[in-house]
Every structure is written in C-alpha cells, then in structure tokens.
C-alpha cells in the first residue's frame, strides 16, 4: 500500500512523508520563521528605516542578517545535495516499484520544493538588497562620524590652547593675589595694632568722662551750695546795711538791685549773665519756697523756663493732683515743673508759652501762645491761651476757653467719661480734647493707631503718639 | 438731617479689588473721623480702619493693612474705602459710620445703610 | 487684640418682661463700651455709649451697667420692636472691638 501525509511536527516546522509499502520517507523543509515578523523595523518586505537607531545597533543588526543569510545559503545546498544523492536512487527505485499515480505525488512535492526555493530565493534577494542597502547607509554614517570626529579633534586642540593661556594666565592672577594677601595681611596687622591703640584710648576717654560726670554732679551740687550760701551772704550783708545805714540810704538799694541771688525764672538768670541751658533753683514768688527747673538758654534767645519735657518715656505721667501740682521728674530728663509754682508765677506777670514738638519721621514743630496763664487751684489750675502762631498747627490743640486741669484722682473734664484715666496723664482735658503731651509714651513703630498717647491733633492727627515735647515760659517782655 | 449714603451692591471676583463710596450730608463733613466697618454672613462686626477728613489722617485695622485703603474728598463730603487682593472671605456688608468725636475714635453714632460686596468666582 | 465676649448667644423673653445680656472684656476696658442694636436689613443704631449714657431718643427702658472688664445691658421692660441682635463695642484701645452679638426674641 501507499499514501502521503502532510503534517507540522513540534518544533512547528512542515514535514512531507511519503509511505510506500515498508519504506518510509520524510522530508524536512528549512523554514522562513528565523526571518523576523513584519512587526520587525527590519524585516524583510518591510520599509527601510531613514537611519539606523545608532551606530553599534547597526553594525549588530548587520551581524544577525549575515548570519541568517550563511543559514540560508548552507539549507539550500543541503538541500540540493539531498535532493542529488538521494532522489536519484529513490526516483529510480520509485520508477521501477511505485504506480503512476505516485508519480503525481513527486510531482507535488517536487514543484512544493521548488517553490520553497523560489521563495527563499526571493527572500533572501530581499535582504541582500537590505543589506547593501543598511551597508551603504553605515558606510555614509561613518564617514559623517570621520568628519564630525575631525572636527571635535580639531575644537580640542584649540580648546587645550585656550587651556594653557588660561592656565598662564591664573598662574599670573594667583601670584597677584598672593602678592596682595600680603599686603593685606601687613593692612590687617596695622589696623589690628590702630585698633587697639583706639581701644585703649576710648578706655581711658571713658574713665575721664566718668570723672567729668561725677565732677558735674559735685559741681551742680555745689553750685546749689554757693547759691545758698550766696543768697545767705548776701541776706547777712543787707541786714549789716539796714543797720548802719538809714532807711532812705539809696547805697543799700543798689547793692541790693546788683548782686540779685534769687530768681523766680530762667529770664532773670539770664539776664543776671548765666547763659548756659542747665539746671537752677528758683525762688516762688513771695517766697523762699525753691524749685529745681531747667533753664533753655539757646531756643530764641534764651531765657525758657522749661515747664515740661518728654523725650524717652523713662518716667510715669500717670500720677495723682498732689504730683502734678508740686512736680515730679527729672529737670535733667522728663519732667514736669509744678502747677502751684506755674500758676504763681504766671500770675503775677505776662508770659508766653512755647511748645516744642518732634515727630517720629525727624520733623519738628512748635506752637507759641503771646499770653498764657494758670488759673489757682482753686479754678483746678484752668489754662488760658491766647495769640496762637507757630507751625504745628492753625487751631490750637489746647481747648478753647482753657478747660480745667484733670488728673486720675481728681476728674474735671467735660467728657462722661474720665479723661485722664481713658487717656492716661494729667492734663487739661475738654471731652477728651485734640491734645494731651502728657500721655503714654510709646516707642517707634508702636506710636500709631493710638487712642491714650502724647497726642497734638492739630500737628499729626489724633491716633498718632510723638516722640518728644518741650513746653516752656518766658516773660512777654524779654 | 445727618445721613450717610453708601454705593450699591458689587460683585467681584477673587483677587480684585473694590472701592465703596460713603456721601456724609446735615453735618460738617470735616468734623468727625469717619470709620468702616464690615458685617461677614453670620460673622461678629469687624473695625476696618477710620479717617480724620480734616487733615487726611488714617489707621487701619492691623488685620487688613497692606488691602484697605481709607480715603475722603472734602469738596463732595465723601468716604471712600478700598480693598484689593480680595478673597471669598471677604464677601460681606461693608458699612461707613461717623464718630461721636473728633479727635477720638469712639463710639459710632451715625451708620451708613451698608454696601453688600460679593466675592466669587 | 481685646476681645469681647457676648452671652447669652440667644434670648427669648416675655413682652414686659426684663431681658439681660452680658458683655465681658479679655481687659480693662474702663467704661469705653458702647451697645448697639441691628435689626434685619438694617445697620446697627447706636444705644449707649461710655457703659452707661443713653444716646439721643433711646427709650429710657434701655440701660447700661458696668467697668473695667464686666458690662450688661439691660431692656427693662421688653417691646415687640425690640426684637433684634445687640452688640457690644470697646473703644478704650486701637483696634475697636465688637462682640458677636445677642439674638433677643420674644418668648
């Protein structure tokens, strides 16, 4: 019996079997499946990529092709050397043994193998043709590599020369600036020894004025002393007069009108010929009650009996009548004169009144009042200002009339309210008024936006705080 | 009688800005500081800042300074007040009201009827 | 800032009947409190001023009590247009400050 099967063994690879009797015969085929799918950039029937991926890809893939192509070329000489030794001997014992219908079988297989061949052939033209192809890219590829690597050699060279100017020319920098360190350093040394010769002057610069501080508070203490004793002198010499002169000797008089020892303001001692701004005591009217004050020598002329100052918030404004009335502070800081003496003095001769007002921005302004006095404190030392001029305002910002004197025991003001407590200071509040320069002091960046500060409405508005104020005195007459 | 009559309603959006307008009549415009406040749905009233028309001087509100803006025209008697860089936040009734007193902030005696300002984009 | 604080929240209380509501200050305030009262659609009107003193035309059933820290209001005799929310305010220090108020119905 006879008969032919076609079928696909496991490698997944055709096989042809052809059974004749006893003898069986199996032909393998050499499969296209080692040529890549389509899906393959470089599959055969497949477009050509513009360029390879990049050069080492292309020199592997190159490699891979002639290694399919040699497999190829050796399958098909096997192939015909098989067919040559084999199919000879068998075609002839085929001939002699087999019917004419296996012929027909041969003649199947025979034309399957040719075309198998036929196929192989064209494709193996197809990827002779890809290589020649894929070759003569890589060979225009290396040649452009040959140029740019000419000109990369060629940029390098003249980059080691740029290098080695450079390199010459740090060498010179770096001597430089070893040359100036030196120098510097000797600078340094210098200004090291200047430094401490400086140190040591401001040492002794410090202990000398520390000396000079004490000797001034010996010397204002002492000058307070001789004034004593001055004025004790000269109460002696006047009543050694008295005695040995009549009463109607005019000698006496005039020693009397000369060596004048007691002051009731800063005008008198100015005009005595002490014209230096300090401290001096001076006398009550109709009295010998003295009082520490501040005398303003150099604004306008000189003669100010400061009656008021603020400048740094070093002293509490927020005290009782009692306080106000006889004064507190520093006449050397802040401080405020009295309203017993003010009002005693104001009372008995025309006086001006100077405010004198800083901002916190380095702006100053001032309102001067032609006529001001204090009203007794029976009236709660009411004020009265008239004549108002000066830069820190066209309205005054002291009320008008004059509102009497309130503090935070001893409420006078016209508002519900008590004003000096809501407001903080003593003052002559209306209801509670445009000013109060005895407030709380507050310091920059803290002086606005409030409610109880050292406040001249008619100058900066109501919420803003100033930084210092000088109210001061002096007779009309001056 | 003494009125203080506010622009109408706005709507913004986020990130802009709007001037509301306050007309002070039946009293000296110059004579009392004038102060805004704003009312946020469901929110406590809020101080945002006052200005003393007689000298131009302002004080804001720590909370909106650097937004709002106080200004006054004295030849028309009006208030305006200015807040930029606006948030959803802000959308409330922004309201103008007069001081009892001049040269204080105290309490707040006449009020504008309120401007509603809404934020939303 | 000083904050003041409102209590009750809320108030229902009988016509003719007496309504308090409280007001406490985080400081000192002294007496620099003012009330106010808003009705719906309305800005708020001012009632009392430094703890205690009616403003103009304000009914006399409407009084203030208080200092330092610790204020009240007080409707003596409660009518139907009292119906509102009422604010306290402190005006003793910079910025102004208000409480969030008090809803007085009636009960």
């Known amino acids: 019996y006879s008969n032919f099967r076609k079928s696909v063994d496991s490698t997944g690879r055709r096989q042809y079997q052809v059974q004749n009797g006893p003898c069986s015969y199996t032909f393998l085929l050499p499969e296209t499946d080692s040529c890549r799918s389509s899906s393959s950039p470089y599959m055969s029937n497949a477009v050509q990529r513009d360029a390879p991926l990049d050069y080492d890809d292309s020199v592997q893939r190159l490699q891979v092709l002639e290694n399919i192509l040699e497999n190829n070329t050796q399958w098909l000489m096997k192939l015909e050397n098989y067919i040559q030794d084999n199919m000879k001997k068998e075609m002839v014992e085929i001939q002699q043994n087999v019917v004419q219908n296996q012929t027909a079988v041969m003649i199947e297989i025979g034309t399957s193998l040719l075309n198998q061949t036929a196929a192989q052939t064209r494709k193996l033209t197809d990827v002779e043709a890809q290589v020649l192809n894929q070759t003569t890219r890589l060979e225009l590829q290396l040649l452009q590599h040959s140029i740019s690597t000419n000109k990369l050699e060629k940029q390098i060279l003249d980059q080691t020369s740029e290098i080695n100017k450079l390199q010459n020319k740090n060498s010179f920098l770096e001597q430089k600036v070893l040359d100036m360190e030196g120098k510097h350093s000797e600078q340094l040394q210098s200004m090291k020894e200047q430094k401490d010769e400086l140190q040591v002057l401001v040492s002794k610069q410090s202990s000398v004025i520390d000396e000079l501080e004490k000797k001034l508070v010996t010397a204002t203490v002492n000058n307070s002393l001789l004034q004593k004793q001055q004025h004790d002198l000269m109460e002696t010499v006047n009543s050694l007069l008295t005695m040995m002169s009549s009463p109607n000797s005019k000698s006496s008089v005039a020693i009397r009108k000369e060596e004048q020892t007691t002051f009731r303001d800063c005008a008198e001692i100015f005009k005595s010929g002490l014209t230096t701004s300090g401290i001096y005591t001076l006398t009550f009217p109709n009295s010998t009650e003295e009082i520490k004050a501040y005398c303003d020598m150099d604004v306008g002329g000189g003669g100010w009996t400061v009656i008021q100052h603020r400048e740094d918030g070093s002293v509490d404004f927020q005290r009782t009548w009692k306080e106000y009335k006889e004064g507190f502070g520093s006449p050397l800081g802040e401080y405020w004169l009295g309203n017993e003496f003010v009002s005693q003095l104001t009372g008995q001769h025309r006086y001006v009144l100077k405010i004198q007002l800083k901002d916190w921005e380095g702006n100053e302004a001032h309102s001067l009042y032609d006529h001001f006095y204090l009203a007794g404190e029976e009236s709660n030392y009411r004020i009265h200002l008239t004549g108002l001029t000066g830069t820190a305002g066209k309205i005054s910002s002291i009320s008008q009339p004059g509102s009497d004197f309130s503090t935070k025991d001893s409420d006078n003001d016209k508002c519900i309210c008590k004003c000096s407590q809501m407001l903080s200071g003593g003052w002559w509040f209306d209801a509670c008024g445009p000013s109060n320069l005895n407030g709380q002091y507050y310091p920059q960046k803290q002086n606005t936006n409030k409610f109880n500060g050292i406040k001249w409405y008619y100058w900066k508005g109501s919420g803003y705080s100033l930084k210092a104020t000088t109210m001061m005195i002096r007779p009309a007459d001056f | 009688q003494v009125q203080l009559v506010q622009s109408g309603a706005e709507v913004k959006k986020p990130g802009s800005s709007v001037k509301v307008s306050c007309k002070a009549s039946?009293?000296?415009?110059?004579?009392?500081?004038m102060v805004w406040v704003r009312q946020a749905p469901g929110q406590c009233l809020e101080w945002m800042g006052y200005?003393?028309?007689?000298?131009?001087?302002?004080g804001y509100n720590q909370k909106f300074e650097g937004r709002v803006t106080i200004t006054a025209d004295e030849s028309t008697s009006t208030a305006y007040m200015e807040l930029s860089s606006l948030r959803s936040e802000d959308t409330a009734v922004y309201y103008c009201a007069r001081t009892r007193d001049r040269y204080d902030v105290w309490y707040f005696d006449v009020w504008g009827q309120g401007t509603l300002v809404t934020v939303s984009s | 800032d000083i904050v003041m604080t409102q209590s009750p929240d809320s108030l229902a209380v009988s016509l003719g009947e007496r309504a308090t509501i409280n007001c406490k200050a985080s400081?000192?305030?002294?007496?620099?409190v003012a009330w106010y009262q808003q009705k719906p659609g309305q800005p708020p009107k001012l009632l009392i001023y430094?703890?205690?003193t009616r403003d103009t035309g304000v009914p006399d059933r409407f009084s203030g009590s208080g200092s330092g820290t610790d204020f009240t209001l007080t409707i003596s005799s409660l009518q139907a247009e009292d119906v509102a929310v009422y604010y306290c305010?402190?005006?003793?220090?910079?910025?102004?400050?208000f409480g969030c108020g008090t809803k007085v119905e009636i009960k």
């Open positions: 305010h402190q005006y003793s220090s910079y910025p102004p400050t």
């Open positions: 200005i003393d028309p007689y000298n131009g001087g302002t």
């Open positions: 400081q000192d305030v002294y007496i620099a």
């Open positions: 039946g009293y000296s415009f110059t004579d009392y500081n």
């Open positions: 430094w703890a205690s």
